[in-house]
């Protein structure tokens, strides 16, 4: 009786179970009653990452430098190439098909999390007592200067974009 289902790593064709090709190999011809499935290794710059019956291997991803991409991990016959972005850039999607420049945090905002090749800069507003007076992808919010520790007094209050201005204490006459 011909099978209706096959074991793992097999597929059903012409009423018989044939072995799938292993990762890194493509299907050349289906098995018969006399021969096993014929498979061939993927060529240079090609891959297949699963047990399969594909007649063509997939091309490795190209990390296009014109899009800000570079190779993070070279592909093999069983794995695709993994791209990442050049320094100062990050991927626009999980597939990392293109890159954009890391966002800078505007004055009044500091860097909460520095960008990576796959994630953008995360900014946060500077809370009371902290400031940022530059647009930066690296600078955190800085604490206001403590005038007291310098034996000075606050002459001008700080904001989220400016530090306090300290000055000498008024002398008692």
């Amino acid at each position: 009786e011909p099978p209706t289902a096959c074991r793992e790593k097999q597929y059903l064709i012409n009423s018989q179970c044939c072995s799938l090709c292993q990762p890194g190999q493509k299907l050349v011809s289906d098995c018969t009653e006399f021969t096993e499935t014929e498979c061939l290794p993927c060529g240079e710059s090609e891959f297949l990452d699963t047990w399969n019956r594909e007649t063509h291997c997939h091309q490795h991803k190209y990390c296009d430098p014109n899009l800000g991409l570079r190779v993070q991990q070279k592909g093999t016959s069983e794995t695709d190439t993994i791209c990442t972005c050049e320094e100062g850039w990050h991927c626009t999607s999980e597939a990392c098909e293109s890159c954009v420049l890391h966002r800078s945090c505007s004055p009044g905002f500091g860097v909460k999390q520095i960008a990576t090749g796959v994630s953008d800069t995360i900014c946060e507003p500077c809370p009371v007592g902290f400031f940022s007076n530059v647009s930066s992808a690296f600078e955190k919010c800085h604490p206001w200067t403590s005038c007291e520790t310098k034996d000075l007094v606050v002459q001008q209050a700080g904001t989220n974009k400016t530090d306090v201005v300290c000055g000498p204490q008024d002398r008692l006459r």
């Epitope: 050349v28 011809s29 098995c31 018969t32 009653e33 006399f34 021969t35 096993e36 014929e38």
Partner: antibody, heavy 117, light 107 residues
Amino acid sequence: EVQLVESGGGVVQPGRSLRLSCAASGFTFSNYGMSWVRQAPGKGLEWVASISSGGDDTYYPDNVKGRCTISRDNSKNTLYLQMNSLRAEDTAVYYCTRAGGKAMDYWGQGTLVTVSS
Amino acid sequence: EIVLTQSPATLSLSPGERATLSCRASQSIRDNLHWYQQKPGQAPRLLINYASQSISGIPARFSGSGSGTDFTLTISSLEPEDFAVYFCQQFNSWPLTFGQGTKVEIK
């Protein structure tokens, strides 16, 4: 008990034709692929032809393609090999074999074909 | 076409000795190889399939190993009835091909 009995061999002149038969018994013939394998005197084994269980698919090596035709009659449990334009190098014992688990798991006793003028 | 090369062509041994027969494929055939035994005046019989799988009714002294391009048939202790010719056969792809055979003879 599985049995394969070949017949039809004999002496034949070059250029002539011959049809070999193989009577199968002891198993469900229509469930198995079948093959012919030959062996020249004192030589090794050489695959000649194969046919799928249903008879739809046939396979041949290049050196016999176009000269040999494998066929089967599942209602008669019989395998055939039609050989045309015979040559001296076709002289051999011809074995009928059953394909079980992709191996030739049962063989007939063979029939001798001699091509000679 | 996949070419199978068997070695040695002849193996001269005494009963009780261990026989090691080699079959080398011209390209990788994974484990898609069978072994057959043929005695004089008889048809071949299947000994081992898929390179190492034993066949019902075949004595346990016969074993096969190997994968890819290099295969071995081992007879652990030769019995008088084991002196015969042994053939390997690949079923990885068409055309089906056999090795030229190894004759195991009595020393």
